[in-house]
Structure formats: C-alpha cells, structure tokens
Amino acid sequence: HHHHHHASQPCPDPTAPPNGHISPVQATYVLKDSFSVFCKTGFELLQGSVPLKSFTAVCQKDGSWDRPIPECSIIDCGPPDDLPNGHVDYITGPEVTTYKAVIQYSCEETFYTMSSNGKYVCEADGFWTSSKGEKSLPVCKPVCGLSTHTSGGRIIGGQPAKPGDFPWQVLLLGETTAAGALIHDDWVLTAAHAVYGKTEAMSSLDIRMGILKRLSLIYTQAWPEAVFIHEGYTHGAGFDNDIALIKLKNKVTINRNIMPICLPRKEAASLMKTDFVGTVAGWGLTQKGFLARNLMFVDIPIVDHQKCATAYTKQPYPGAKVTVNMLCAGLDRGGKDSCRGDAGGALVFLDNETQRWFVGGIVSWGSINCGGSEQYGVYTKVTNYIPWIENIINNF
C-alpha cells in the first residue's frame, strides 16, 4: 500500500462514518494509498441518497482524497407494497421500514385467505422478506364455497334463491342465455357448448355476477380475456368433454354475493355417490316454459350411472350418449331438473368435512322434455377435469 513520493503531500487521516469502519488503517496515507469503507450489517453505503456497493478513495498528489467519504445509512426497505384484497400493519412502529423492522400482511377477513403467516422483516439486502425467505408479496386468495344456502333435500320443483345462496353463479349473455360458475376471482367454469364460437367473438359475451334477478340493472360486469374450450369437445357431436374456462380481463372483488365455488378435493368422489344430493341453480326454463326472472335452484340426487346410460339408450337424445365424463342427477319420476338456459351452471355439493360447497358437475345436456320421468339431467363430471383446469389456470 505504501508508495512514498516525497514530492507529494500526505492525505488527511480518513474518519470512519458512524456504523462503518475503514480499512486499511495506516499511520499516514500518501500518493496512491487507498482506503475502503465498510458498513456494519444492516447499513449501506450512501453518497447522499444514492446507494453504493463499495467505496474506495485514493490519495492524490495534492494531498486530497479523490472522493468524499460516504455515509453508512441504515437499510431502508421503503414502504411495503400494497396487498391486493389485504392490508399491512407496521409491527415495529408506525411507518418504520428500516433494517429488522417487522410488518404484518393480512387479508380482508371472511372473503380472502393467506397461506403464509404474512410476517415480513426488512433484511440487510433492502427487501421485505418472509420467514420462508420469499421477497414477493403474499397472495390473498378468495375463500370459496361459502353459502347461506342449507341443503334441505327438497325434491320438488325449483325454489327461488336468496342473496348469498349461490354467490358463484354467473350469468352469460350472448345470443342465448347460459350460466357459469366462478372458480377463482378471474376464472369462470362453464360448459363448452355454452361458449362455443366465442373464442374469437369474445366481445359478444356479456358476463354478469352478484345478481338474483336475471334482468337486474345492478350487477358486477366482467368481460372475457380468453376462452378455453376442452380440446376433446366436438360441437354438434355429443357432449363429451363439455367443459370450458373463461379468463376474465379483471379480477372481481369477492363478497357475500360474489364468491368462487371450490373445486372438488381428491376425496370428493365419496360425496358424490348415487342418491347423494347436489344443488343446481339457474335462470333457465321453468315448468312454465319461460326463462326464470329470479335465480332458481333445485336439490337433486345423483342417479346411478348405468341406470342413466340405459335410460338414454331407451329414449335417445340426438347425437348424444352418456360417457364416463358425465354424471346424471334427477328423479326417476321426474319433476326436478335443470333446463335450457341453465347450461354451464354448477351442480354443487356440500363437503361436510370442510363445510364448503364444491362443484361436482356442470349443466350439460338432457332430454328436451326437462324434468321428464327417467329423463335425467346430464352434467359434465368435474372430477375428471381437475388436471385440465389447473393446467390452464397455472399456465395462463
């Protein structure tokens, strides 16, 4: 380090900034000698407000250092980012955002939930960091499957729904009326035949939610960003793989009247056995043969798959047959069914363990004579499509 040039003046002894130290420490510093400044953990080199990773000054011929000593300033992670559908609390103190400060993220209660504990600490690298070492924001995921509806097993014609009974119910308006089910704050599950031809003409698809009255002027509007129809669905050639997903342009805010339906857990099959009761809602044709003004629902039992397949071989539906990708529901004697205009809506079941409702079926097809004896409603079997659904959502 020492280069003695007697023609030059020594430089003044450098003074370490608070929370920092200088290296090397020498008795004198002459031409071309240098020193570096190092800050202790949790502090950073700042020249004014501009951060530096390292600092070295060199002694010049005129006996001055070539640059001024920076400060060692406490790391400031800055104000934490806003959490969509949540908020942040300062734990260490009001607005304290410096090294080792703690903040707590939480989601809007009732309607959103967080998988992590939401606690973040301002670390030495200047980033808010979770206990798992994550620097990205936690996610407030919508709660799913909460409903004010209690399944009473009423096996009669439709009943009018009450607010909060079917908050996942989505009204699809195009050339015809159809339905869908919200399964995330920006994804709608529906029947492929209900949105067929809409992949390009998406602007013609009007998506409404948070309503009971079909013609209500007060509703939450959503528009499609993309429509995904199952690649195994062939329009006009039966209803196998009658499933589609609509990606919404914007996330909808979850509340008691707009909430996703849960996707079935692996154990769901045990809750959808023959004679187990599900519930379907819609604005489709009623007994009177007109679209319902108010959202209606019916509680219907699942029908033995073989019995349903046999019924539809006796009284065939043109071009359709019951496949393993379908489940049937209804009464042997008829009288309770979904109908045209209900297509794409969810057949839901209560998971007694979680006390949440999940989607087991999507209204797909059935006899022209809705609710006829041994003319069961046929639904797309959602459990067969969980990988397909997750693949599309995760890769969008």
Partner: antibody, heavy 114, light 107 residues
Framework: DVQLQESGPGLVKPSQSLSLTCTVT?????????WNWIRQFSGDKLEWMGY???????SYNPSLKSRISITRDTSKNQFFLHLSSVTTEDTATYFC???????WGHGTTLTVSS | DSVMTQSQKFMSTSVGDRVSVTCKAS??????VAWFQQKPGQSPKGLIY???YRSSGVPDRFTGSGSGTDFTLTISNVQSEDLAEYFC?????????FGGGTKLEVK
Amino acid sequence: DVQLQESGPGLVKPSQSLSLTCTVTGYSITSDYAWNWIRQFSGDKLEWMGYISYSGSTSYNPSLKSRISITRDTSKNQFFLHLSSVTTEDTATYFCARYWGDYWGHGTTLTVSS
Amino acid sequence: DSVMTQSQKFMSTSVGDRVSVTCKASHNVGTNVAWFQQKPGQSPKGLIYSASYRSSGVPDRFTGSGSGTDFTLTISNVQSEDLAEYFCLQYNSNPLTFGGGTKLEVK
C-alpha cells in the same frame, strides 16, 4: 469504457404503456451503483424518474410513483423503464445514467400522440 | 422535495474570462451536488460531483464549491467550447432534483 444505450418505440398513443431499455456495456449493473432513468422535456427541463440499484432495489420519483416501474435483466446487463397510462405530457427525451450522472446514454426521443 | 434554483437562465462571457454559475437549494443538501454540461443535441456530461470533486477527464478550469444550500460552478479562462447549458443536481435526498439550467453564451 462504460457505455449506456437507450432504445424504445419512439411513438406511443395516449393511455398506452411505455417500455424503454437501457443496455449497459463495459460495466456490470450488479457490480455497483444506481442506474437511473432521467427525462428531458422540450424546454430543457430535466426530471429524475427513478433508479434501480446494484442490488435490485428501486427508488422512484413520487410524482410518477403510481405509473412507474424499473426492472432489470442481469443476464443481458439491461435495465428497463415501464411507464403506464402515458399522456402527451410524457413526450420527452429519455436518458439512462449511472450513479450521480457520471455516465449517460445518448437518449431516445419519445412522442406521445394519437 | 429539494428545489434547485438557477436564477440566471442566460449568462454572457468572453473567451479567457472567469464566470460563475450559481445554484441554490431550498433545503440543506450537504455537499451532494453535481454539475453537468450539455451541448445542443447531446446528452449531459458530468463535470463535478460532491460539490467540488472534478470528474475524470474534466479540465481543471472547471471548479465547484459550496455546501448546504449555495453552490457555485466556476469556469476560469473560458474557452469557446464551453458554450453550453449548465445544470446542477442534488442527490442528497429522493427525489433527485435538477436546476432549471443556465445557458452560457460566449461573445
């Protein structure tokens, strides 16, 4: 020798988003310093927009905070300016610069017009 | 925000003269001030940082001084190539702020 070079679209319509790239040669953006975006309006007024530091931390001008984002691609030694909802007021020459301004790019002119 | 005021928009000088460009900060900015020279059609060039430290390659006729709120860029023995606009910048606190510029005209 340290060199900075801005690139961008030149013309953007109002309400659209703007993305500019600063490519740095002769020095790694993760080695040290803060890497700034600065713009100059037609009357010669200069405005500091924000920086991304060697560590990846960012600081923005509060006047732009809701619209601005500065990111980087360390593998390409580039940093980026993203500005949303542009208006004709964002018409300017955009510069990238290092540290306090010891090195600057040549600038790229942006016009916001329908 | 610290407002940087360059009260003289234009200054006129002759080759060989000494000229001082001033900049006033609305708040104490310590010595965290830089000076830039910008010629028409070019990007700004750093001359001085930390109020008085000359950037490498800058002729020693350019000197900076001041601290706190008052800062001066002095050009002794002005040359014709010094015809340019000069800006000050404070980088003491965010947001960094520039002065409005002073155009130097060489007679």
